[in-house]
């Protein structure tokens, strides 16, 4: 009974009951029955011992060792704000794909670091809260071996264009502040637009499991497509925007836009471009500078702001950024007032004037004479692409491009007072710009990058993938910590635990089969002794 119940837990009771019936059928005498029952019991008992032993050995051997966890910190010093990301991964799986994940994001209170150019002494205080948060999240024993990287993007690229010395002073103070923490500070630098695009592409494809050569039994990753087809990356910041993807045909038309990677044993020929001044905030400054040129007085009736919205802008602020230099002119006033009229179609037309599509020295261009190969595959659109579209409730895969346009028309035409009431919890500065930002995103994707109503369905607005933010920071850290090998790491087909488990299972099966074999085919002579 015990034997049967134990075997039934392994799902083998049926097999044993069938096997024991021939022995029962051989009841030529009570003695023979007694002997065979005893032998069966002994064999059964031995099997139980073997099972327990094998399971015990297997389980003991497989008892999880205390996991050695590593951490890394990346600060994304963007044009509008700075965010700190903390990543963790099991040390023994460093070269595996998809093992690094984000454990924390801390948004630094205040503007981007480039805005501290006249008050560099405040940078230390500015970074304190998030660095202290990192101290709390990461175990103290790990502090000294946790690398910290700061990458500054287009806001600092623009400051460097204005004054390299001032940009350096900001970075010097940032570095001094960050080196006071107990972590392994690796320096602050302004990353290039090409890096920003490339690392964003690496991040999303790493998180989506696109670099994994192993066959997956099941998928926990959303946006499942042909597993080997990488996703393109669309990144929108405040001061720049990046497009990165693997084109259908390897192109040498514009070497400046070509990158070659070898990741996990596979070659990738990637197209990337970063459009400086075409982030959503700088695009708005460009549009205002362009539109004020033709304004008859200091009132700018603007279709990109809700009806009833009013805001005073200083001309000196308008011309402060290098992005508006091409529109700069002497105006007969120091200030002007934006008055919203909320018209999507007119706003769209105004935005289109920022893209010069009349000149293209290549077979095909995006805008401003920049080469763009034909779009290929699916795209992940993240950062401000996601934040804006998510606010507007337009991130669903089911929403067509036509529907998005309709929703934008409706949203932009809503009176400002109504909008303020509907979104009472949102800061007015941000709230007021969603009409422009949404319109800009549509214009950039459709007219700038040449997505169509049909290819729109290949754009996936992504905030996080499996708990990690989509953006350049993870790819940056993976690269700097050498966690993306060029070659596919040599690994056994099974994990150690699976191997041990299967070995135990097969051993059990072999033992049971052997017992059955003994019982059926090799009946000992004493079974029949004295049976004449």
């Amino acid at each position: 009974m015990l034997f049967d119940s134990i075997l039934s837990t392994v799902g083998l009771s049926k097999l044993v009951s069938v096997v024991s019936s021939p022995a029962a059928a051989l009841s030529k005498s009570n003695v023979k029955t007694f002997c065979s029952k005893n032998i069966l019991a002994i064999l059964g008992f031995s099997s139980i011992i073997a099972v327990i032993a094998l399971l015990a050995v297997g389980l003991t051997q497989n008892k999880a060792l205390p996991e050695n966890i590593k951490y890394g910190i990346v600060l994304d010093a963007g044009s509008s704000h700075t965010s700190l990301y903390i990543y963790k991964w099991p040390a023994e799986k460093e070269n595996d794909t998809g093992v690094v994940h984000q454990v924390e994001e801390c948004r630094v209170k205040g503007p981007g670091i480039s805005k501290y150019v006249q008050k560099v002494n405040e940078i230390g205080i500015y970074l304190t809260d998030c660095m202290e948060r990192a101290r709390e999240v990461i175990p103290r024993s790990q502090h000294q071996e946790t690398p910290v990287y700061l990458g500054a993007t287009a806001g600092m690229r623009l400051l460097r264009m204005e004054s390299e010395e001032l940009a350096d002073r900001v970075l010097d103070v940032v570095e001094r502040s960050l080196s006071n923490y107990p972590f392994d500070f690796q320096g602050a630098r302004i990353i290039t637009g090409q890096e920003e695009g490339a690392y964003g592409w690496i991040t999303i494809n790493y998180l989506l499991g696109k670099f994994s050569q192993k066959t997956r039994w099941f998928s926990i990753v959303p946006y499942e497509t042909n597993n080997q087809e990488t996703f393109g990356a669309l990144d929108l910041g405040g001061a720049s925007t990046q497009i990165t993807f693997v084109p259908q045909n390897q192109t040498t038309e514009s070497p400046d836009n070509a990158l070659q990677f070898r990741l996990y044993g596979k070659d990738y020929n990637v197209y990337t471009h970063s459009f400086l001044c075409y982030g959503k905030d700088q695009a708005l400054w460009q549009k205002l500078a362009k539109d004020i040129q033709v304004a008859s007085n200091e009132i700018l009736r603007d279709p990109c702001f809700h009806p009833g919205y009013k805001k005073v802008v200083n001309v000196s602020d308008l011309y402060k950024t290098p992005c508006t230099k091409r529109f700069e002119m002497t105006l007969p006033f120091q200030q002007f007032e934006i008055q919203g009229i909320g018209n999507y179609q007119q706003c769209h037309q105004s935005v289109l004037e920022l893209f010069n599509t009349s000149y293209c020295p290549y077979s095909q261009c995006a805008f401003n004479g920049i080469f763009l190969p034909p779009l290929q595959g699916d795209f992940g659109a993240f950062s401000a692409f996601y934040f804006v579209m998510n606010f507007l409730n337009l991130t669903s895969e089911k929403v067509s491009q036509e529907k998005v346009t309709e929703m934008m028309k409706k949203f932009c035409s809503q009176p400002w007072e109504e909008i303020k009431t509907s979104y009472a919890g949102v800061k007015e500065k941000y709230l007021s710009e969603y009409c422009f930002s949404g319109t800009y995103i549509l214009s950039l994707l459709l007219q700038g990058y040449h997505f169509t109503a049909d290819s729109w369905e290949h754009i996936h607005f992504i905030g996080k993938i499996q708990g990690s933010d989509a953006g350049w920071t993870l790819g940056y850290m993976l690269n700097l910590t050498n966690m993306i090998p060029a070659e596919q790491p040599l690994s056994t087909p099974l994990s150690h635990s699976t191997y041990v488990f299967l070995m135990v299972l097969f051993s059990l099966v072999l033992v049971i089969v052997a017992i059955i074999g003994l019982l059926i085919f090799h009946k000992p002579s004493y079974f029949w002794k004295d049976m004449v």
Partner: antibody, heavy 121, light 107 residues
Framework: QVQLVQSGAEVKKPGASVKVSCKAS????????MHWVRQAPGQGLEWMGR????????WYAQKFQGRVTMTRDTSTSTVYMELSSLRSEDTAVYYC??????????????WGQGTLVTVSS | EIVLTQSPGTLSLSPGERATLSCRAS???????LAWYQQKPGQAPRLLIY???SRAYGIPDRFSGSGSGTDFTLTISRLEPEDFAVYYC????????FGGGTKVEIK
């Protein structure tokens, strides 16, 4: 504040080598390139080469290739310039000067006080 | 390598006067890669201008730079007693080179 402090004056015989040090302080040493420039008595400035302290990579002016070696010690935030096979025309004041951050332009923002190297038999 | 020729070799002027120093390159130089330095006797050079026209931090606005291509100019609008020194232009194109210098002396 940012400072570059160089080692003291040296007198060397022709054919010998000299090693001048430059200790940096007041900033993150690995973030900026370091250059060496020399100035013979009454003459103009002559660029010798540069080192990237982060990775230790160097770039030498053609004139000094094979004779100059630039190294760094990140633990002490110090760069070194060694010039071998000295001749009398190597008598000059040798300056270290902080160069650019990655992605910046090559102008020399901060200079050491200079080290006079005299080559005389 | 690009050769920079500075002229005049010596400029004799009085305090309060305007000084115009020239630097000519043997081939075109990106304006991002041209700088000016001031050197006083017994001292290390000091950066004045970079990007051909951007004043370095702490440099008085009487110093200004201009030019592009092969011709660059450093202008001191009103000479102060402390401005009498040697001025060097510098370019970067793979390798750094300096001009021979212009000495601005009191007349």
């Amino acid at each position: 504040q940012v400072q570059l402090v160089q080692s003291g004056a040296e007198v060397k015989k022709p054919g010998a080598s000299v090693k001048v040090s430059c200790k940096a302080s007041g900033y993150i040493f690995k973030s900026y390139e370091m250059h060496w420039v020399r100035q013979a008595p009454g003459q103009g400035l002559e660029w010798m080469g540069r080192i990237n302290p982060s990775v230790g990579s160097t770039w030498y002016a053609q004139k000094f290739q094979g004779r100059v070696t630039m190294t760094r010690d990140t633990s002490t935030s110090t760069v070194y310039m060694e010039l071998s096979s000295l001749r009398s025309e190597d008598t000059a004041v040798y300056y270290c000067a902080r160069g650019k951050r990655e992605g910046g332009t090559e102008y020399l923002r901060v200079w050491g006080q200079g080290t006079l190297v005299t080559v005389s038999s | 390598e690009i050769v920079l020729t500075q002229s005049p070799g010596t400029l004799s002027l009085s305090p309060g006067e305007r000084a115009t120093l020239s630097c000519r390159a043997s081939q075109s130089v990106s304006s991002s890669y041209l700088a000016w330095y001031q050197q006083k006797p017994g001292q290390a050079p000091r950066l004045l201008i970079y990007y051909a026209s951007s004043r370095a931090y702490g440099i008085p606005d009487r110093f200004s730079g201009s030019g592009s291509g092969t011709d660059f100019t450093l202008t001191i609008s009103r000479l102060e007693p402390e401005d009498f020194a040697v001025y060097y232009c510098q370019q970067y194109h793979n390798a750094i080179t300096f001009g021979g210098g212009t000495k601005v002396e009191i007349k």
